[in-house]
């Protein structure tokens, strides 16, 4: 007999064909010989089956000798052998209905686990293979699990259920809730305004939750909460903010914080956490602030950086358009008795300048000017 695979909630067409290309009498029954539907002349008649309100046919195909049974909103328990009786013949079709669902919500936090569960009719022995949006294949039986979801797992998961050499495909949209970047670093000269942005890697209709930015200044012994805020339907409202520094926060997404001035005492690392309504766990983004200061005191020209710098970063002092006078993998460099002219302090990574501060050194009889 013919095997047809269906998906829970879907619509399926079971075909039945007569040799005569005209409308003749037919009827469909289930394995218990209960009539589902048939015809009486041109009228569609229905029997007392459980499918009554979900069974249909297509009158326009009867004239072609086709007498389909269409079952809408399929349920697992619709799995059965269906018999079409036409022209003193019986055609049997075995329908197997499968369902594939995500364990909980399809919106999961980065690092959480995804479990896909297959619902199948008794007596079936299907195999399942799923392909993630980044092309990773996972195989299993009744359940498939993926631990430690990553941002790249967001998107459509395509799962193929195989049974009796037939296959049925499911598509499940998974949204991994995370910030676009796990970590970011901002480089600023002393006194400059600092902008921190925390763009989300997903979009949802309504976004509600609360968040906080904790800051560990390099110079401080312990971390401190700089700001707490609420998020209601994508609208941001500040709950509490420290007096020093007095951060400002944008009212709309993406989450946006402004520090009026970059000062050495603020250099350090922050951790922004966002707890979303009806979700266990929090989203995290690390943010780092590196501050540079160039100063001239008497005969000493000094350049310093504060904050989390990598050991491979190079700090240099050079006179404009000349070779670097000093260049070290350290957080402070200086030049004694600097020549007059425009000096540049550069923080660079493999030749790429990350931060630059200029200071004008005047002839010895003058005082220095900082542009």
């Amino acid at each position: 007999k013919k095997v047809v695979l269906g998906k829970k909630g879907d619509t399926v067409e079971l075909t039945c064909t007569a040799s005569q290309k005209k409308s003749i009498q037919f009827h469909w029954k289930n394995s218990n010989q209960i009539k589902i539907l048939g015809n009486q002349g041109s009228f569609l008649t229905k029997g007392p089956s459980k499918l009554n309100d979900r069974a249909d046919s297509r009158r326009s195909l009867w004239d072609q000798g086709n007498f389909p049974l269409i079952i809408k909103n399929l349920k697992i328990e619709d799995s059965d052998t269906y018999i079409c009786e036409v022209e003193d013949q019986k055609e049997e079709v075995q329908l197997l209905v499968f369902g594939l669902t995500a364990n909980s919500d399809t919106h999961l936090l980065q690092g959480q686990s995804l479990t896909l569960t297959l619902e199948s009719p008794p007596g079936s022995s299907p195999s399942v293979q799923c392909r993630s949006p980044r092309g990773k294949n996972i195989q299993g039986g009744k359940t498939l699990s993926v631990s430690q979801l990553e941002l790249q797992d967001s998107g459509t998961w395509t799962c193929t259920v195989l049974q009796n050499q037939k296959k049925v495909e499911f598509k499940i949209d998974i949204v991994v809730l995370a910030f676009q970047k796990a970590s970011s670093i901002v480089y600023k000269k002393e006194g400059e305004q600092v902008e921190f942005s925390f763009p989300l890697a997903f979009t949802v209709e309504k976004l509600t939750g609360s968040g906080e930015l904790w800051w560990q200044a390099e110079r401080a012994s312990s971390s401190k909460s700089w700001i707490t805020f609420d998020l209601k339907n994508k609208e941001v409202s500040v709950k509490r903010v420290t007096q020093d520094p007095k951060l400002q926060m944008g009212k709309k997404l993406p989450l946006h914080l402004t520090l009026p001035q970059a000062l050495p005492q603020y250099a350090g690392s922050g951790n922004l956490t966002l707890a979303l309504e009806a979700k266990t766990g929090k989203l995290h983004q690390e943010v780092n602030l590196v501050v540079m200061r160039a100063t001239q005191l008497q005969k000493n020209l000094t350049c310093e950086v504060w904050g989390p710098t990598s050991p491979k970063l190079m700090l240099s002092l050079k006179l404009e358009n000349k070779e670097a006078k000093v260049s070290k993998r350290e957080k402070a460099v200086w030049v004694l008795n600097p020549e007059a002219g425009m000096w540049q302090c550069l923080l660079s990574d493999s030749g790429q300048v990350l931060l630059e501060s200029n200071i004008k050194v005047l002839p010895t009889w003058s005082t220095p000017v900082q542009p």
């Epitope: 619509t11 041109s42 009158r59 326009s60």
Partner: antibody, heavy 115, light 107 residues
Framework: QVQLQQWGAGLLKPSETLSLTCAVY????????WSWIRQPPGKGLEWIGE???????NYNPSLKSRVTISVVTSKNQFSLKLSSVTAADTAVYYC?????????WGQGTLVTVSS | DIQMTQSPSSVSASVGDRVTITCRAS??????LAWYQQKPGKAPKLLIY???SFQSGVPSRFSGSGSGTDFTLTISSLQPEDFATYFC?????????FGQGTKLEIK
């Protein structure tokens, strides 16, 4: 909830080929037939043809020689091509889901044939 | 092809009126008939199928009846949002065909 979204060129010259595509979002694609219907300005509705997920088609005999309906099941999309258009093919073209009745419908695309 | 003929082609009525639109098929179509409502610039909307079954969400003031060749759509008490064009459609055989439409206007 099933939604149909259609697109295609809105202005054609006589003898050109009309080409429209309809995407189906939500619901079952495989269990239904997918139709094209047109409505000339201020006039009634004319059924053009239909296709199912496996590519089985039925066409209106009055247009059959010029019509091709195709399907891309992987994208839940189906398309209409109508060749050698004339001014008489100017109409709003609709896509729709069908078993026996048309429901739901796409938003419609006005196609004007003019030299 | 089965011809579907609607009458009248237009009708003027007032809010609260009872309105009946008829559709005649050129041959027996049993109960394979649907009714649609269309407002200007919009796609048609299914109201009644299988001659007398309500599509979900359709107000109960709409009803359909008939079998064979003669069918009626009745609106028991016209509401302002009911002023539109109504079409019948047969699903008995290919090609599917529609009536020419009945325009329901405010008196």
């Amino acid at each position: 909830q099933v939604q149909l979204q259609q697109w295609g060129a809105g202005l054609l010259k006589p003898s050109e080929t009309l080409s429209l595509t309809c995407a189906v979002y939500g619901g079952s694609f495989s269990g239904y037939y997918w139709s094209w219907i047109r409505q000339p300005p201020g006039k009634g509705l004319e059924w053009i043809g239909e296709i199912n997920h496996s590519g089985s088609t039925n066409y209106n005999p009055s247009l059959k020689s010029r019509v091709t309906i195709s399907v891309v099941t992987s994208k839940n999309q189906f398309s209409l091509k109508l060749s050698s258009v004339t001014a008489a093919d100017t109409a709003v073209y609709y896509c729709a889901r069908v078993l026996n009745w048309f429901d739901p419908w796409g938003q419609g695309t006005l196609v004007t044939v003019s030299s | 092809d089965i011809q579907m003929t609607q009458s009248p082609s237009s009708v003027s009525a007032s809010v609260g009126d009872r309105v009946t639109i008829t559709c005649r098929a050129s041959q027996d179509i049993a109960d394979w008939l649907a009714w649609y409502q269309q407002k200007p610039g919009k796609a048609p909307k299914l109201l009644i199928y299988a001659a007398s079954s309500f599509q979900s969400g359709v107000p109960s003031r709409f009803s359909g009846s008939g079998s064979g060749t003669d069918f009626t759509l009745t609106i028991s008490s016209l509401q302002p949002e009911d002023f539109a064009t109504y079409f019948c459609q047969q699903a008995n055989s290919f090609p599917y065909t529609f009536g020419q439409g009945t325009k329901l206007e405010i008196k």
